[in-house]
Amino acid sequence: MMTGTIETTGNISAEKGGSIILQCHLSSTTAQVTQVNWEQQDQLLAICNADLGWHISPSFKDRVAPGPGLGLTLQSLTVNDTGEYFCIYHTYPDGTYTGRIFLEVLESSVAEHGARFQIP
């Protein structure tokens, strides 16, 4: 029986050209995490395997950094990075847990404008 839950950073926004950390955390289970896959819209970004360590997809090597922990850091963000990201936790003996994060990458001026008019 799968008792675990995935906690994520949820919906997040960041400025174009900046960086963002994607984080998921598996809790409420004693299952062993054997591998975590990070995916974006049917594309593999990176994999962290308990035995083999990190593998970053070649097409993302310049903009993706492993960590912190089992998380992933996206750098030099572009508006095209807006979208859904998934962390897929492969565990033993539970099976697979999936978390979802939605990232919105904003033009710098839009982000600044939005910050100026936040409701206190």
């Epitope: 591998q35 995916e39 049917d42 594309q43 593999l44 994999i47 395997n49 035995d51 083999l52 593998h55 997809s57 097409s59 492969h90 033993y92």
Partner: antibody, heavy 118, light 107 residues
Framework: EVQLLESGGGLVQPGGSLRLSCAAS????????MHWVRQAPGKGLEWVAY????????YYADSVKGRFTISRDNSKNTLYLQMNSLRAEDTAVYYC???????????WGQGTLVTVSS | DIQMTQSPSSLSASVGDRVTITCRAS??????LNWYQQKPGKAPKLLIY???SLQSGVPSRFSGSGSGTDFTLTISSLQPEDFATYYC?????????FGGGTKVEIK
């Protein structure tokens, strides 16, 4: 350098048994899952069996389930395929392959030919 | 089981030609699609993994694209050493399944 070397193939009668071995070198064997894949003469590739690095997960193709057993000895860096109740349709070249991250098969052995015939 | 359908089953091309091979899965497999090259009497060799990632040491004239159910292997400029049989393979679920192969022959 990663190397996978199969052995144990040969001619066997229908109903007979064979044990294939795959000797691995050049990498940390127990960190990698492994597959057996076969290829009948003049035909395409067919997956046979999978074993995780610690042998905790094992899967078989329906065509060999109950007849073939995959195993590994991590102390000897060796993968095995015990084949029982062999049939003519098991005739093929058998390859072992390494599986990083459970997604792709990055290194393959040279293959060993199994011929099942009376 | 997930069925993998490759097309064409064979093709004739000349050195320098652009060659495209397609692979279709019977259900969505996300990016879990790999491409292999096999020459007669030899073991398969990994070319492309996870749909579009070029395996280390493989020439950049090979590229892969697609996701979901439809995938493509492209050889931008065919070289003499590229005449071989090419297979796609899904690793989305067991049993792992391969396409029937595409034999690339000299025209």
């Amino acid at each position: 350098e990663v190397q996978l070397l199969e052995s144990g193939g040969g001619l066997v009668q229908p109903g007979g048994s064979l044990r294939l071995s795959c000797a691995a070198s050049g990498f940390t064997f127990n960190s990698y899952a492994m597959h057996w894949v076969r290829q009948a003469p003049g035909k395409g590739l067919e997956w046979v069996a999978y074993i995780s690095g610690n042998a905790g997960s094992i899967y078989y193709a329906d065509s060999v389930k109950g007849r073939f057993t995959i195993s590994r000895d991590n102390s000897k860096n060796t993968l095995y395929l015990q084949m029982n109740s062999l049939r003519a349709e098991d005739t093929a070249v058998y390859y072992c392959a390494r599986v990083p991250y459970s997604v792709w098969l990055d290194y393959w052995g040279q293959g060993t030919l199994v011929t099942v015939s009376s | 089981d997930i069925q993998m359908t490759q097309s064409p089953s064979s093709l004739s091309a000349s050195v320098g030609d652009r060659v495209t091979i397609t692979c279709r899965a019977s259900q969505s497999i996300s990016y879990y699609l790999n491409w292999y090259q096999q020459k007669p009497g030899k073991a398969p060799k990994l070319l492309i993994y996870a749909a579009s990632s070029l395996q280390s040491g493989v020439p950049s004239r090979f590229s892969g694209s697609g996701s979901g159910t439809d995938f493509t292997l492209t050889i931008s400029s065919l070289q003499p050493e590229d005449f071989a049989t090419y297979y796609c393979q899904q690793s989305y679920s067991t049993p792992l399944t391969f396409g029937g192969g595409t034999k690339v022959e000299i025209k």
